[in-house]
Structures are given as C-alpha cells and as structure tokens.
Amino acid sequence: IIPVEEENPDFWNRQAAEALGAAKKLQPAQTAAKNLIIFLGDGMGVSTVTAARILKGQKKDKLGPETFLAMDRFPYVALSKTYSVDKHVPDSGATATAYLCGVKGNFQTIGLSAAARFNQCNTTRGNEVISVMNRAKKAGKSVGVVTTTRVQHASPAGAYAHTVNRNWYSDADVPASARQEGCQDIATQLISNMDIDVILGGGRKYMFPMGTPDPEYPDDYSQGGTRLDGKNLVQEWLAKHQGARYVWNRTELLQASLDPSVTHLMGLFEPGDMKYEIHRDSTLDPSLMEMTEAALLLLSRNPRGFFLFVEGGRIDHGHHESRAYRALTETIMFDDAIERAGQLTSEEDTLSLVTADHSHVFSFGGYPLRGSSIFGLAPGKARDRKAYTVLLYGNGPGYVLKDGARPDVTESESGSPEYRQQSAVPLDGETHAGEDVAVFARGPQAHLVHGVQEQTFIAHVMAFAACLEPYTACDLAPRAGTTD
Amino acid sequence: IIPVEEENPDFWNRQAAEALGAAKKLQPAQTAAKNLIIFLGDGMGVSTVTAARILKGQKKDKLGPETFLAMDRFPYVALSKTYSVDKHVPDSGATATAYLCGVKGNFQTIGLSAAARFNQCNTTRGNEVISVMNRAKKAGKSVGVVTTTRVQHASPAGAYAHTVNRNWYSDADVPASARQEGCQDIATQLISNMDIDVILGGGRKYMFPMGTPDPEYPDDYSQGGTRLDGKNLVQEWLAKHQGARYVWNRTELLQASLDPSVTHLMGLFEPGDMKYEIHRDSTLDPSLMEMTEAALLLLSRNPRGFFLFVEGGRIDHGHHESRAYRALTETIMFDDAIERAGQLTSEEDTLSLVTADHSHVFSFGGYPLRGSSIFGLAPGKARDRKAYTVLLYGNGPGYVLKDGARPDVTESESGSPEYRQQSAVPLDGETHAGEDVAVFARGPQAHLVHGVQEQTFIAHVMAFAACLEPYTACDLAPRAGTTD
C-alpha cells in the first residue's frame, strides 16, 4: 500500500521542513517545575513503542507507522541504561530504585542501595534510599501513585518502600524469620512510610486480614485478604486522614474525584493486578486514563504542586506471557493516559517524563507490507515450510514441546488476543531485555533529558527541576503562575 | 559481581549530579556547520548498541554496561522512524534514501521517491532525489564515502545513485531490458553521477571487465571483474582527475593519505564486501578506523569543508547470519572509527551524526549476572532442559531442523565467533526489525536532533546545518574559524 501523496518528494520535504522549524523554535524553559509526572511503561522497550504506534494508528484506520503516539510529541529524548548493580538485565525493583530514588540497587530489591542483598532482611537497615516522591511530599507537594498492577508491585513500591524482596506484598509473603528481624511487607510500608495523597490501582487482598472476603469476588477465597497480622490496612490508612476515602470500583472513584471534601484517595480495584484493558469490565474497573484523570483532579488542588507516578504496569505482563496483543493494547491505554494528562496539565509548570524500566526480548521483523496487521504474518514461508509472524520473542512461553516441531500459524490465529508469539527458547515466562530504553520529556527543565544516561539520571532531573533535595539550591526561576 | 563502590548511594548521586551539571552547561551552537559527518551503523538497533557497549567494556576488563561507547558521549539523541513507504520493516536502500536524501522511498530502491517501483526501470526517470552529499559537493565542499561493505552497496549508494534495484551492482546484474531502457548499474553511477573525492571500501570486482583477475586473489576467477561492457571504471575515474589515485591495500592507502599531491582517492580493498573485522588481514586491508582517518586527512584540506559518510556496514551482515559475535565486533570497530573521527575534527565546526538505517530481530535477555560474557548463557534451564544464551534472534539461520529439537549449548560453544544464536523461526537469513533507531548528534545544530522524527529528518538537519539546498537561506552565523 503506497499512499499517493507520499510518492511526491514534496510531501517529505515539507514535513521535514516543518519538523526543522519546530526544532529551531524549541526554547529550554529556565523555570522550575511546579509539578512532576513520571509515566512508566513497564517493559516498554523501543520495539514495543514502535509496534504500539502502528497498532494505535491502525485502530484509527491509518496505515500505522506515520501516526504519532502522545509520547512521540514530547520534544526531548534520551536513552537510559537500565542494568542493575548485579545484573546486565534488570527487574522492575532495581530499576524503580534507579529512576525513582536516583540510586542503582540489586535485582529484586526496592528502595535500597546495592549494599542490600536480595532476600537478606538484615541488610535492609541503613541502606534505604529516599524517592523523589518522598522528597516532594516533604517539600509540601501532594503526591500520588497510579498503576494497572497491584499498588504494592515493584515499580510503584519504588516510590515509597524499602525491601530486600519485591515479592513481600503482604506479611504472609514475608518469612517468619524476616518478620522477626523487623522487615515489613510492602503493603504495610504503603500506608506507614509516608503520606501518599492518591493511591490507585490493584492490590486489595494484601490490605486485609486472611479470611476477609473480597467485595467484588466474595465467594472466591483465593481473592480474599491475605494478611496474617489481622490488620485492616485500609482502615488504618483512613484513620490517619480526616478527608480520606477508600473506593474499590469505577463509580465510587469518579464520585470521589469530584468531591472537594476528599483530600486523600485510595482506590483498589482488584484483589491483585488490575485486569488487562481488553478484559476490563468498564462498569466496575476504571481505565488507566480514568485513574490518571482522577489523580490529577485531586493533586492539582495543591498550590505547591504535585508529584505523580503513573504506570502502565501490565505491558510487562503481556510480554512475559508472550502475548503481544495484550502488551500492545496495554501500551495504547498507557499512551492514552499520557495524552489525557497532557490535556489536564500545562507544560509551562509541569515536567512530564515518559520512560520504561526495561525492555523485553520482543521483536518486530519479517518485512511486512505497510498497513498490514502488526499481529499478522510475514511474507513468505520459513525453512520448515510454515508461516511465521512478524512479532516474535527471543524466549518465552510461545512454544510447543510435544514433538519439537514449530507449529504452523494462520493470520486468524496470530490475530487472536490469546495468541502467544513463538520464541527461540521455551520458558514459562518470557524475560526482560537489557537494551537501553527511551526517555521522553516535556516541560520545565525537560531539555536536560539528553544523550545516553544512567537510569538514575531520571530521578535527579525530576529533583533538580522541582528544586527538591539535594537540589534545593537549584537557582531556577519560579515557574510561571506559581501561587506559593 | 557487585563493585563495592557502587554499593554506596554517593557513587550514583555524585555521578548523576555530574551528568546534570553537564546537561545544564549544554549550549546549542548557533553557528553553521562547516563539515558534516554521518556515521551509519547498518542494522545497529538499540539492542545492538547496548550489547556492543557491554562487549567493548569487557574487552577493557570492565564489567561492561557502565562503560561509554564513543557515540554515547554525543550530547543529543533522537529516535528515527525507519519504515519505508511500502513496508513496515525497511531495507537499507529505502532507508538510505531517507537519511541521505531526505525523502522516503520504496523497499530496495535507492535515491528515488516512492513514485518509483522496485525493479521497474521505466519508473526511474523524473523520480530521482538528490543526496545531501551531492548538494555539499555543489556548494564547494569535498565529499567522501567510507564503508566496510562494497562501495556500491545500498547504504553508500544512497549518497550518489538512483536505482530501482539495489542489487544492480555492475552491469552484469542489470537485466538487458533495463540496460536498453537506459538504467545504469550502481558502479557506473559511482564514477559518473557526481565527483566524489574519497571512495573507500570494498567492491573491486564491479569496476573491472569480466576476466580481469583480482590483484589480491588472481587465481580465483569468481573474485575477478564482472563487467560485461568491457569498461574499466577505475581507469575512467582516474582519468577524470589530475590528482586521483587508486589503491587496493592498506599500505598504499596509508601512503596516499599522507601524499599532498593526492586530491582524489579511491581505495577498494576487497572484490566484494570487506572482511569482517575479526577476519581482516591487517597487513592487507585497512580497518574502518584507518579508512575514516585517511578520508578525514584528505577531505579536511578543503577550506570550504566536507561531507563524509562512514558506514559500519557489516554489523548488518553479522546479524543476518545470526552471528552476534560478528555483528558486535563490527559495531565496536564502527565505534572506534567514531572515536578517531572525534579526535581529528572539532565539534566547533563539524556536525557529526551517528545513526542506524534499521534494526534487527536481535535481543539480549535472560537476567545474566553483571560482568558475565555477553555471549554467555542465561541462568537456569529452559523448559526443554537445555541451556540457552542471553543473546537470541526472533528469526534467522540459528536453527537445527533435523529432529525439530533445539540443540543444547555450552558456554564455550556460545562464545565462538562462528556460533549462530538460536531463533524462533528458521530462516536462511535473519531479518531486519522495524522499531525506531537512535540518532546521536554532536556539533553545530546538533540540538535540532530531538524527539521522535521521521528518518528523513536526518538529511534535512544536515542540509540546514551546513546551509545547503534547500536551506541556503539558513540564517546561521558562519562557524568559528571559517576560512571561506
């Protein structure tokens, strides 16, 4: 498919001249940022960004790659080196420590320097590192965490927790010996480490005592409370704040976000992770875009500004399942949230960053025709005389071990939301990848986001832009329209 | 392996503060570029960059990812959308048209708008688009092409040729009907379309008549001249310029580059593509770094400046073979050439860009320990009870079809330069990938390289920076120290 206008060199020359004009007009804002938003696409490597762009375009009846994601419109781009101190290819815990706290840690640890050792409780104390969100709170800003995973998951936990094991969601997950040594589960830290104004995502079951039925799935014991300490953490959190509200469904969320008496909001919409966007019951669960909007409505009331973490956390899960359909539809919803946030904020006073914690062994090849489905087949046959998809994984669960032979695939099979793309190596979970990821930036001090940087740089740019510790002597003009 | 200094948060905080300091000091140069250099890593997607960084670091006895490639030091980064007008995943011909001419074309065509159709000679005329190199020459600059492939290959050909088929290296490759219609082979266009001051790479056999023995392999008929028209294109080229010299080995190249009487230099060091860096006979063939240095010595004599295209062209070939060792060692030599060029030029007057034409379905996963070999095994076993490598391909020739079962692999096997990493889909050649690639920029107007751009933007930035067509009214101050 060749669009006739693209056959004319003028089309490309005009377009490039316009892009050059925009580039020449770019003026680094010398003001401080009143607000900080970090959008984290978990597992959203560059291959995921491109594939999602094409899918988003095709959902709008375009050919695909010529369209723009919301993040594509951000004027500044850098590359971020994602390795953890102990691994070439990191996990979401060590990376969260890097981009939220500004310090690299070890694989599967959160909010701790690399002096802490995975799973060794006694290496926690004294090795805690403080997140930019925590520093923003100390500076009088409102702060929020929004995610499509459980709110106690590795990425959001980087904003508030310190743990040698990212899997310690509730106290039931913490070994008795570690509990005795004083190591707290992540859910406990969520409500006790710092005052978070807005908490939206999944993770209900970690907040309630064992035996507490889940409000949405009361007959499913496995979805009920998991806590062994008998604590109702939601109740404890509500008791801390006069204007606090807890919600567990979309209707309540939308009401609460418009209620001026609500100062603190916790919304936990699933017992564990939230449902994939394609499976979401839109009467019960809000989308990431809706959660982001609700958070911004509350947080933006603070004249001193806010810090907001927004995670498209299940991009990663789709990839781990080798189900690109899930990963890419999650990426599109993540991008929709970025777009909505852009409409609700001003780049005059809000530094917005979009990045990934790491990539995945996900590739998009095979020379497909422009306009063909991103989930489709490559032209020609493979050496085993079978068709193959343009999307593939290096490793993962897209395998059939029975007779060793790779299964054939049809266009209708590969287009299914349940289809698992094939992989070279059969694993029960596809793995992360270690290549650099993109950082997109817009707003005050966004121009500092440049070149190739350590992932830790992201936290430091945010702290500097908002004149937070350790950059309180930032020497930046107050942002326009500041009221503080 | 955990470096003890990295356990201390101060290590990361200091490092990030320094990076912030450098970012704050970045001042966009408002001058024009006297010189333009585009370094093209063919097939060098972001996963290749990261893996090469680790390998380069480990060759220096470091753990790997914390080290810097020369390209990592470039202050500005953008992402480039590489699709061709007709394909989501492009080839090196259509992409060369984009980044060298500023216009997107169709798969496997070169130097032509998308109105031209692959292999249809009669769609050539009237659809030619002019490269930045050609425009630089018209503006009085010296120009050069350096590559590790044959100089008639798709990427370098984008600088000087117009062809509906990238495979028409010599007239023997052009169908008689197309020859009759007036379509010229790429080798002919190399010497006749424009005056190129420096031409260095492979591709001897396309320049000489059939039956001409190759000077390096005189007994191998397949390496001798291929031309059917009886022309000796080297002789024709030498006759055009008083100070022209042709060389075919390293010794002659080094002599010629230091000879002030040489104004034009053609060095063709292999009959076809140059040898992989790991196979290069360093007494006979120069490295990419040496060719780059030789080119710069000649080109920099021109007070009006120069345009230089430098291609690490066999990164791509290593990937097509699913031999990551070859791809990554080629990338390191490419980076060494960038480093050397940086020492021989000034960023005050030279705009240097580093980019890729496209990526490959190459991934680096599996959670290997920091410091472990990039060519090594991932921790754990796969579901088929076998080991697996951290480097893998989505598709490609790293397969065994005999009994359908994936072969086991040992650390010593996977570390071999000949080892082919495994792939999900068995193909005789691994394919390109369609995700965005990085553009690294340094020098005058490098700040224009930002955000997410069409690949065409690269050519326009170069043209604008040097005030070439269509940006002669560029309104930029002459660069410091201009002598023209």
Epitope: D91, F107, Q108, F118, N119, Q120, T149, R150, H153, A154, R166, N167, A172, D173, G272, D273, H317, H320, E321, L401, L427, D428, G429, E430, T431 | G366, Y367, A378, P379, G380, K381, A382, R383, R385, A387
Partner: antibody, heavy 130, light 111 residues
Framework: QEHLEESGGGLVKPEGSLTLTCTAS?????????MCWVRQAPGKGLEWIAC???????TYYASWAKGRFTISKTSSTTVTLQMTSLTAADTATYFC???????????????????????WGPGTLVTVSS | QVLTQTPSSVSAAVGGTVTINCQSS????????FSWYQQKPGQPPKLLIY???RLASGVPSRFKGSGSGTQFTLTISGVQCDDAATYYC????????????FGGGTEVVVK
C-alpha cells in the same frame, strides 16, 4: 560422571541437632540447578524438605520444616542441612537431590521453578533415639 | 498440597500393563510440572518421567506419562521383571513460594 554424596548422618538424641552435608562431584553448583533435601522414613514414602538456588541463595521449605531445618550452600560443591529439635519422627534416610531450575514469571515476579529431581545421592541414615 | 497416589500396591504379570494414578488437590505449576520416579530397595529414586509426559534419558519407551493440571497417570506396558519397584509421583507448586509434594507411592509386584 556426576555424583552426589551425603554425609553426617548417624545417631542423635531427641531434641538434639545435626548437620548433614551433600558433596557434588563431576559438576559444580550453578544457576541451572536447585540443590535439595528429601527424606524417607523407614518403610515410608518420600518427603520433600527444602531446596536452595545457588545463584541467589533463595531457599524454599516444606511448611513443616520451616524454623527447624536450614539449608545452606557452603561452597560451590557442598550444601548442608542443619536440623534442630529433632524427634523420633525425623528418623529417616536423608537424600540430597538436584532439581532443574526453570525460569518462570509467576504472580508478577521473577523466579526459578523447582522441577524434577534428576540426580540423587545414595542417602544417609539419621536415627533419633535416646 | 496433597498428592493421592492409587493404588498403593499392584501386581502384574510379565508382559501385562500397569496403570498408576495420581491426583493433586490443586493444579501443579503450569499444569505440567509433574514427574514420576522409580525406587528399588536400598537405592535412591530414579527419574522416569518429567513434564508430565516426557521420558527421562535412558528410560525404556514402555513407560508412559500422561495427564495435566490435577490428574496424572503412569502406564507401564509390557511389564518386565526389572520393573518391580515402588513408583512415586511428584508435583511442583507455586503459591507465594515454590514447594514440592510426593505421592504416597505405589508398589509394583511382577509375577
């Protein structure tokens, strides 16, 4: 040839402690395997006790073994099982076994699954009696 | 987790077929993290079948494993005298942590 050999068994009094050692030959512990302990009371079936992943030191225990039994890697070829508060019910042959470690992504986290036991030692008898 | 193995004892004539069942109280991980072992008196167990149905190296093809999730079967066709032993099933589970369980064993007597 790959072998496992247990040592340290013998007679121990009730409430006493004992440490068993498993020594590997022909291979060294790596990220490809878990090292585990399984026991078998006289005339009874097999009972899993614990496993350790040598790569990161992660340990997993049967619920009944938590607190009383501790598995450790002491070198690249030895693992130990420390047993405390022993009772007559702990009388058994204790086997050291190797299990394949498969990467898995479970419950939102990374792990290596303990799969089948592909290599066993001959066992060492522990008798708890006064 | 409970793995119920039936029968606890079975006798078979040479050349006959033996079927042993194993039922799990919950699904094993990935529905196929399931193995079968053979143990002879005074010896450690020996792996026969892994991943529910795959034959371990050197194991004769008369041993066959099948099943998925919670129900698994070991079938020995063309029983030989050397097959007299006790057979154990084993499953791998995940619930916040990995754990393993063995069945109670089935003694196979060959007549």
């Amino acid at each position: 040839q790959e072998h496992l050999e247990e040592s340290g068994g013998g007679l121990v009094k009730p409430e006493g402690s004992l440490t068993l050692t498993c020594t590997a030959s022909g291979f060294s512990f790596s990220s490809s395997y878990y090292m585990c302990w399984v026991r078998q009371a006289p005339g009874k079936g097999l009972e899993w006790i614990a496993c350790i992943y040598p790569d990161d030191g992660n340990t997993y225990y049967a619920s009944w073994a938590k607190g009383r039994f501790t598995i450790s890697k002491t070198s690249s070829t030895t693992v130990t099982l420390q047993m405390t508060s022993l009772t007559a019910a702990d009388t058994a042959t204790y086997f050291c076994a190797r299990a394949l470690a498969y990467y898995a992504y479970v419950d939102g986290g990374h792990s290596y699954a303990i799969n089948d036991f592909d290599l066993w030692g001959p066992g060492t008898l522990v008798t708890v009696s006064s | 987790q409970v793995l119920t193995q039936t029968p606890s004892s079975v006798s078979a004539a040479v050349g006959g077929t033996v079927t042993i069942n194993c039922q799990s109280s919950q699904s094993v991980f990935s529905n196929d993290y399931f193995s079968w072992y053979q143990q002879k008196p005074g010896q450690p167990p020996k792996l026969l079948i892994y991943d529910a149905s795959r034959l371990a190296s050197g194991v004769p093809s008369r041993f066959k494993g099948s099943g998925s999730g919670t129900q698994f079967t070991l079938t020995i066709s063309g029983v030989q005298c050397d097959d007299a032993a006790t057979y154990y099933c084993q499953g791998t589970y995940y619930s916040s942590a990995w754990y393993n369980a063995f069945g109670g064993g089935t003694e196979v007597v060959v007549k």
